[in-house]
């Protein structure tokens, strides 16, 4: 049973090398891959290893978030001598192996990208048989998902002293700029909270006091596009109605 060193060196390709006399593990991943939400992306990962002509059982794993301990999003296993890596796990069915692990390629395709996929991903290969060894990328590849703005919520809420306030929440990458327009407002960026903690792609803008009845429009814009939505405020004897 042999292991190889985990000392890491990197170049611009994030090549990670473990070496000891006459042995070498390395993994090559790009620092970042960019793609638009809804599209597909390829996460490249190739490796070298010290076990010449290894054709025993192997497993290919991709995980998200952090190396070694992050949740697995994809896993496949190839039997001894087989070039077919049988998928055992594909989160939401959106992950598919493009590369051939027998040819030192673990490249992964991610379908139907969402903003939530914007994370760092780590590839790992495991040998089990006469050879007992494994290697995992420590630095991984950042998947940068871009998206045109989308307004996910717009609402009118009561606030103290029989007043009303409006909230608009949008998502996008880059995070969109929000603007309100409406009766006696012109364009306003009042009380923009950007981005919400723990929700890196969400931006919220608040109009703290709606003083006039009428239509209030929230516009979200970034370099990829714009989106707008409206609410209507009508006060009938202290009641309010809002529609989008």
């Amino acid at each position: 049973f042999v292991r190889t060193k985990i000392d890491t060196t990197e170049n611009l390709l994030n090549t990670e090398v473990h070496s000891s006399p006459a042995q070498r593990w390395s993994m090559q991943v790009p620092p970042e891959v960019s793609a638009e939400a809804g599209d597909a992306a390829v996460l490249p990962c190739t490796f070298t290893h010290p076990h010449r002509h290894y054709d025993g059982p192997l497993t290919a794993i991709w995980r998200a978030g952090e190396p070694y301990a992050g949740p697995q999003v994809f896993r496949c296993a190839a039997a001894r001598g087989s070039e077919l890596c049988q998928t055992a796990l594909s989160l939401h069915g959106r992950f598919r192996l493009l590369g051939n692990p027998r040819r030192n390629d673990l490249s992964l395709r991610v379908e139907r990208l969402a903003l939530a996929d914007d994370r760092r991903y780590f590839c790992r290969v495991e040998f089990a048989g006469d050879v007992h060894d494994r290697y995992e990328s420590r630095h991984g590849v950042r998947l940068h998902v871009t998206a045109a703005p989308r307004i996910v919520n717009i609402s009118v809420l009561p606030s103290p002293a029989h007043a009303f306030r409006a909230l608009c929440t949008a998502e996008g990458e880059p995070p969109p700029a929000l603007a309100w327009s409406g009766p006696a407002l012109g364009n306003s960026l009042a009380a923009v909270r950007s981005p919400r903690e723990g929700h890196g792609h969400l931006v919220t803008a608040e109009l703290p006091a709606l003083t006039h009845d009428g239509r209030y429009t929230c516009t979200a814009a970034n370099s990829l596009g714009r989106s707008e939505a409206s609410v209507y405020l009508f006060r009938f004897h202290g009641a309010s109605g809002a529609s989008t």
Epitope: F1, T59, G70, L89, A128, H132
Partner: antibody
Framework: EVQLLESGGGLVQPGGSLRLSCAAS????????MSWVRQAPGKGLEWVST????????YYADSVKGRFTISRDNSKNTLYLQMNSLRAEDTAVYYC???????????????WGQGTMVTVSS | DIQMTQSPSSVSASVGDRVTITCRAS??????LAWYQQKPGKAPKLLIY???SLQSGVPSRFSGSGSGTDFTLTISSLQPEDFATYYC?????????FGQGTKLEIK
Amino acid sequence: EVQLLESGGGLVQPGGSLRLSCAASGFTFSSYAMSWVRQAPGKGLEWVSTISGGGGSTYYADSVKGRFTISRDNSKNTLYLQMNSLRAEDTAVYYCAKAIGSSWYSDAFDLWGQGTMVTVSS
Amino acid sequence: DIQMTQSPSSVSASVGDRVTITCRASQDISSWLAWYQQKPGKAPKLLIYVASSLQSGVPSRFSGSGSGTDFTLTISSLQPEDFATYYCQQSYSIPYTFGQGTKLEIK
């Protein structure tokens, strides 16, 4: 809740058999290698056995090879250790443990059961 | 088999102290080393994996370092709940082996 729960321990005579079970919950059981680790009273930790996520690869400490068999039922999220030809020196608390982030090996054990006591004595 | 040797076997310290425990492998194990904490009657708890990665939920006063054959677990400022036994473990090759343990006691 992510947890492991062992059962099946007890008092057994030398030469006897016992089967330990470990019920897993809160994680994708088949994605991870699982192990048994034991601890004799007042002593340190000793690795016993590991099984791959799919169950196709098993590994044993020399001290139990040929006597103990590790297995798993992924449909029941359960790990087993069949212990035969038990000896006094097998007396210990037996823990099941999950491998961190791996289907075949353990880079570390990140989740442990509470342990089950096995006493081998006449 | 790879032997893991911890030192010291026991150490007495006070709350607020900085404590260092070392672990030496009988051969190069790269960074395939983990540290565990165990309290009496309880299962071990993972603190550090792959020599220096802090397990989720473990306080940042715990840190690990080293590669090759020499490794260190450091507790920067001892808290009352840290008094326990600490084990190192190599996962470089099967059989996985543990150090004999270091008991951390209140001075």
